[in-house]
Structure formats: structure tokens, C-alpha cells
Amino acid sequence: LPRWRQQWSGSGTTSRFPETVLARCVKYTEVHPEMRHVDCQSVWDAFKGAFISKYPCNITEEDYQPLVKLGTQTVPCNKTLLWSRIKDLAHQFTQVQRDMFTLEDMLLGYLADDLTWCGEFNTFEINYQSCPDWRKDCSNNPVSVFWKTVSRRFAETACGVVHVMLNGSRSKIFDKNSTFGSVEVHNLQPEKVQALEAWVIHGGREDSRDLCQDPTIKELESIISKRNIRFFCKNIYRPDKFLQCVKNPEDSSCLSGI
């Protein structure tokens, strides 16, 4: 008899999830010599252990600690790039500026980027039909807790001048409810981080407003300053320049600036 399966509001686990994670891990460790020591089977086992057989609305950051431990990685000071609501452009940037890193350029972020997963209580099966939606079902689901965990860790380990790319086309340029606003901002360590520099990316071709004066940016400045971290903001126009460099990765002058 087919077993009854809980119906969640969100889409189910990405097809071929175990194979995808394992393949990504192998690829990452091949490309990044400093991570060659990582055993990808152990990584998958730790990943699986965080959510398999567990009620998918009761996942904790503790569940992911074995995985976090295996994926420990450090970013050089001044090279961390956070982002909010502008993922693709942030990734285009680090694709060109190879010495800067978003969370998705690190092993754990790379493994999980754009994937969905969940299991079921008391069974070893992966649920490919549906997974909990953050709004409609619960916030302590496997995907949300994963990103909260690794985002917290990413922010905690950042040092020097940290950059954040923000979407100037959104009504809330800085959103307190985003992962950046709710997790990363509060986990930057004042004793290690000397400044946060926000890059507000303008969308409009003819846009020449000063979005660094936006009330939500003032709010971000206030939060950061209260944490004894200096705050800077820059208007960034012509985001199409990022893609132009990405299209020609062989052009080394795109990488170095000049």
C-alpha cells in the first residue's frame, strides 16, 4: 500500500538531488585545490543527515553543524561580497573579479545554490513531491535553516572591508527581512570587520538618483554604525558592464580593473 505523504505548499526536492550535490562537490574540489582534502561522500552523508528522517518543520541549525564543519573555508580579508535580491549580478561580478567571493562561491553555498530538499519524519526517503514553504508552512524547514546557518557562518568569518550588493530597483533597497538584513548584518564581527560598503545597483539606463540617500539605506547605516562598524555607500550605474566582462572571460584586464 502506498504510504500517506504530507502535502506541503512548496515544490518538492529537486530531481536527482543526491547525485547533483555529490557531482557539485566533486567538481568544486577539483577546481579549488585548497578543498581537495574534502571527502565528498562524507559531505553528502552529513548533508543527508541534517534532514533525512526528520520532521521538515522542525529542522535546527544544530542539524547542519556536521556539514558546516566539513565545509569550513575562509575568505581573505576585504574579499567578502554579500548580496540581497540581486544574486545573478553578484555572481556575474565574482565570475569576473575572481578574488572576491559570495556565499555561493564557497563549497556549501555552491552545493545548495538553487536547489530544494526535504525528507519525512521516520523514513529514509527524500520527498520529491512537496516541501514546506517558508511563508505558508513553516520557517524551520531544511532549505531555510540551511541558508540561515551558512549565511550566519559566512558573515561571522568575514573580515576587513565587506561589500554588499543591493538592488536599487526594489522598493526596499535594504530589507530587514532578507537573509542579509536578518542574519548577515547582525553576524558581522566588529572586532574583525572595519567597514561595510554597500553597492546600490541602479537599473534604469537614465537613472541618476542618489539611492544612497534612500531611507532604507539610512536604516542600514544606523544598524551598522550601532554595531561599531563603519558604513559606506556607493551608487553603481551601468550594471551591463558586468555582463560585458563575463562574456569575454579571456580578457584579463576585466579581472584586474586596469
Epitope: 541618476s208 542618489d210 551601468r238 551591463d240 560585458q244 584586464s253 576585466c254 580593473g257
Partner: antibody, heavy 120, light 108 residues
């Protein structure tokens, strides 16, 4: 190494036209915004026009809008500036300049310039 | 449009520090670039992104940008640094502006 060589300058009467060219080499031309900047004799620098790498976006200073047209041929690694309805105040050395990439909008490399003189 | 204001001239003794200012409304919200231009030559980028030095530019050149003012600092100024210096910024659309330029004179 990066090289930018302007040509096409000369003496032209007010109301006349001129087409400047800039031959680029030493970098992937289509990756960069390109610009024209001018300098009147004994005066400061003035940005004239810019064009994106693809080249779907063009920008003009108010002083030349409607009279000048910037264009590029990525297959020939060449930047152009078509100047119509020229005025005495357009007299200047015209420089072709390559933009910085990514978040920066300044000029990494400049040509040696070509002199445009508008006079009757 | 933002307007960039520079002093017309700055004088400095050899070996001393020269500071050239560039002011504009909320200039700290925009990246600033500095160019050196010697007579009869094309401008050369000496500082980009407020404070970054292109390769080949001596370490004595540095830049900063806070409040409404960006500053180009030349430490241990040498005779060869005598030139015109221009600041520049970009405030979107067709608003790419240069300051009026500062003539740096190295005395002696």
C-alpha cells in the same frame, strides 16, 4: 598593450561635419564602454559621449546632444564620433578613452587625441 | 547634476605633501577618479575608485573620499609631479563630470 589611436580631426567651417575614428588594440574591445572626451585650448576636460560594449546604450553631454552621434564597430575594434552642425565652441582636442570595468566608471586608457578646429 | 569644484592652483615644495581637493554634493556616494595631465600630453589615470592606484602609478599618490570632498594626496612630491590634476565622477545617465582642474606647481 592597450592602444587607442584617434584620427579624422581637422579644420571645418561652422555648421559643417566631421567624423572621428578611434582604432583600438590590445584588449577585448567589446568588453568595454568607450568614450569621447574633449579639451578646448587652455581649458579643462569635458566628457562628450559614451557607448556600451554591445552597443545598445549611448550617452551624450547636453552640449552635443542632437548634433553628435557615437557608434562603434566591434568587428573592426573601432569607435566613431559623427559630428554635425559644428560650432566654434566645439574646437578642441578630442580624446578617445576606454572605460574601467565593473563598478568603476572612469577612464583607464586614453588616446593621444585629434584636434578639431571649427572656424571660418 | 553634481558639480565638482577644485582649487585652480596648489603649490608645494619638493619632498613635501601636496593635497588637492575636489568637492561636490554628497560626493562620498560616488566613486571618484583622478587624472594627471602634463602639457601637450593625454591625461593619465592616477587614482580610481576613490583610493585605488593603477599599476605603474607611484605609491606616493593616494586618494580619499568622505563627506562632500575627495582628496588627492601626493607625499614626497617630486618635480616630475608638476602637472594639471582633474577629478571626475559619474552620477548616472549622461552625468559624467570633471572638476575644473588644479595646476600643481612644485617650487624651486
Amino acid at each position: 598593450q592597450v592602444q587607442l589611436v584617434e584620427s579624422g580631426g581637422g579644420l571645418v567651417q561652422p555648421g559643417g561635419s566631421l567624423r572621428l575614428s578611434c582604432a583600438a588594440s590590445g584588449f577585448t574591445f567589446s568588453s568595454y564602454y568607450m568614450n569621447w572626451v574633449r579639451q578646448a585650448p587652455g581649458k579643462g576636460l569635458e566628457w562628450v559621449s559614451g557607448i556600451s560594449g554591445d552597443p545598445s546604450n549611448t550617452y551624450y553631454a547636453d552640449s552635443v546632444k542632437g548634433r553628435f552621434t557615437i557608434s562603434r564597430d566591434n568587428s573592426k575594434n573601432t569607435l566613431y564620433l559623427q559630428m554635425n552642425s559644428l560650432r566654434a565652441e566645439d574646437t578642441a582636442v578630442y580624446y578617445c578613452a576606454r572605460d574601467l570595468p565593473l563598478v568603476y566608471t572612469g577612464f583607464a586608457y586614453w588616446g593621444q587625441g585629434t584636434l578639431v578646429t571649427v572656424s571660418s | 547634476d553634481i558639480e565638482l569644484t577644485q582649487p585652480p592652483s596648489v603649490s608645494v615644495a619638493p619632498g613635501q605633501t601636496a593635497r588637492i581637493s575636489c568637492s561636490g554634493d554628497n560626493l562620498r556616494h560616488y566613486y571618484v577618479y583622478w587624472y594627471q595631465q602634463k602639457p601637450g600630453q593625454a591625461p593619465v589615470l592616477v587614482i580610481y575608485g576613490d583610493s585605488k592606484r593603477p599599476s605603474g602609478i607611484p605609491e606616493r599618490f593616494s586618494g580619499s573620499n568622505s563627506g562632500n570632498t575627495a582628496t588627492l594626496t601626493i607625499s614626497g612630491t617630486q618635480a616630475e609631479d608638476e602637472a594639471d590634476y582633474y577629478c571626475q565622477t559619474y552620477t548616472g545617465g549622461a552625468s559624467l563630470v570633471f572638476g575644473g582642474g588644479t595646476k600643481l606647481t612644485v617650487l624651486g
